[in-house]
């Protein structure tokens, strides 16, 4: 039921799930200098029954200075460069009750979490696309992709989206936000998932329940 590959890569665009289907896994990764606690969970899992979905297991990180034989899970710099990333504000919404039946919302950050989030999606997951700042969608309406099972094999539908840089120099209100890098993930990467996110609290944004993220590519 896990999707075999990642959602389609669209140049100058990023994607986000509104909610995560039961069965979705989120790797417990720690930032550099920290590691999972001994006997800590490898991942969080979206589970539930007909009326309630929540993330099982809690990710916990501790300082690597503490002598321990637990394997370091912080991504190495070369691995970080290869993964598709987005910047993310710290979610402010309650998270254990699902937004949609059979779905979990974005888990809150855990202490000393890695700058990337790696999700393993399941069949039926939908992700939504948005052109990064400075780029325009040529098509009208939303752009989305769904992981489907066809003839025993999973595939993501292709979103109707082309993001173009055709615009005058834009001036953005308030604080300047980082411009997107046009670089995409290398073709060779075929891991089972996966969105990753860079946590960053930005001012001026008060979100009630939505996953509050600003989307650019990792630089």
């Amino acid at each position: 039921e896990l999707c075999d590959d990642d959602p389609p890569e669209i140049p100058h665009a990023t994607f986000k799930a509104m909610a995560y289907k039961e069965g979705t896994m989120l790797n417990c990764e720690c930032k550099r200098g920290f590691r999972r606690i001994k006997s800590g969970s490898l991942y969080m899992l979206c589970t539930g029954n007909s009326s309630h979905s929540s993330w099982d297991n809690q990710c916990q990180c501790t300082s690597s200075a503490t002598r321990n034989t637990t394997k370091q899970v912080t991504p190495q710099p070369e691995e970080q460069k290869e993964r598709k990333t987005t910047e993310m504000q710290s979610p402010m919404q309650p998270v254990d009750q699902a937004s949609l039946p059979g779905h979990c919302r974005e888990p809150p950050p855990w202490e000393n979490e890695a700058t990337e989030r790696i999700y393993h999606f399941v069949v039926g997951q939908m992700v939504y696309y948005q052109c990064v700042q400075g780029y325009r969608a040529l098509h009208r309406g939303p752009a989305e992709s769904v992981c489907k099972m066809t003839h025993g094999k999973t595939r993501w539908t292709q979103p109707q989206l082309i993001c173009t840089g055709e615009m005058e120099t834009s001036q953005f209100p308030g604080e300047e936000k980082p411009q997107a890098s046009p670089e995409g993930r290398p073709e060779s990467e075929t891991s089972c998932l996966v969105t990753t996110t860079d946590f960053q609290i930005q001012t001026e944004m008060a979100a009630t329940m939505e996953t509050s993220i600003f989307t650019t590519e990792y630089q």
Epitope: A13, K16, A17, M18, Q89, Y128, Y129, Q130, C131, Q133, Y135, R136, A137, H139, R140, G141, P142, A143, E144, L161, C163, E166, M167, E168, T169, S170, Q171, F172, P173, E204, M205, A207, E210, T211, S212, I213, F214, T215
Partner: antibody
């Protein structure tokens, strides 16, 4: 076909706050921005700002920075606009409007709510 | 901020007339311009986006043209339902701004 249904008219005192809601009926939010536009009686249209529901990124008009907050609740497909420290010149019809494409909040508006009249009077 | 100047502010016309409304931007906005129609007590309705693209469901008598700083909305043959106020909107640069409106009234 998605429709945007807004909350009812409000009468407020100067200095108070108002929170207007905008619910997507007949569909759910996606990554299309929800913007807020107001129109004072007999006047033209003024863009207040916009937010992308799933992504959460918001942009506000400079003149309203610090007084306005836009949020969304994806579980109910509802957007909210809160305006604080109300003044008499905030009296207007407030519209929510959906962006026509996934180009952030810098977009045209293809679907509009019916409008919410907010009167600020002592 | 980009100023959007519409002319004329009021236009008197008869059914069947060809009507042209002009919108000027204080600086180039490429083709990122939309036109809306608004009737009293109602929300605006999108007619044209990206300067010349007709929104789905809008009658073909409406057309838009222009790029850079000069834009026009043309109604090829004015119908009774077209008497309303028309606004242009630029969405190239924040903040998004609207023209002051052109009221099309019955002559």
């Amino acid at each position: 076909q998605v429709q945007l249904v807004q909350s009812g008219a409000e009468v407020k005192k100067p200095g108070s706050s108002v929170k207007v809601s905008c619910k997507a009926s007949g569909g759910t939010f996606s990554s299309l921005a929800i913007s807020w536009v107001r129109q004072a009686p007999g006047q033209g249209l003024e863009w207040m700002g916009g937010i992308i529901p799933i992504f959460g990124d918001a942009n506000y008009a400079q003149k309203l920075q610090g007084r306005v907050t836009m949020t969304t609740d994806t579980s109910t497909s509802t957007a909210y606009m809160e305006l604080r420290s109300l003044r008499s010149d905030d009296t207007a019809v407030y519209y929510c409007a959906r962006g026509g494409s996934v180009s952030g909040t810098l977009v045209d508006f293809d679907i509009w709510g019916q409008g919410t009249m907010v009167t600020v009077s002592s | 901020d980009i100023q959007m100047t519409q002319s004329p502010s009021t236009l008197s016309a008869s059914v069947g007339d060809r009507v042209t409304i002009t919108c000027r931007a204080s600086q180039s906005i490429s083709s990122w311009l939309a036109w809306y129609q608004q009737k009293p007590g109602k929300a605006p309705k999108l007619l044209i986006y990206k300067a010349s693209s007709l929104e789905s469901g809008v009658p073909s008598r409406f057309s838009g043209s222009g790029s850079g700083t000069e834009f026009t909305l043309t109604i090829s043959s004015l119908q009774p339902d077209d008497f309303a106020t028309y606004y242009c909107q630029q969405y190239n640069i924040y903040p998004i701004t609207f023209g002051g409106g052109t009221k099309v009234e019955i002559k």
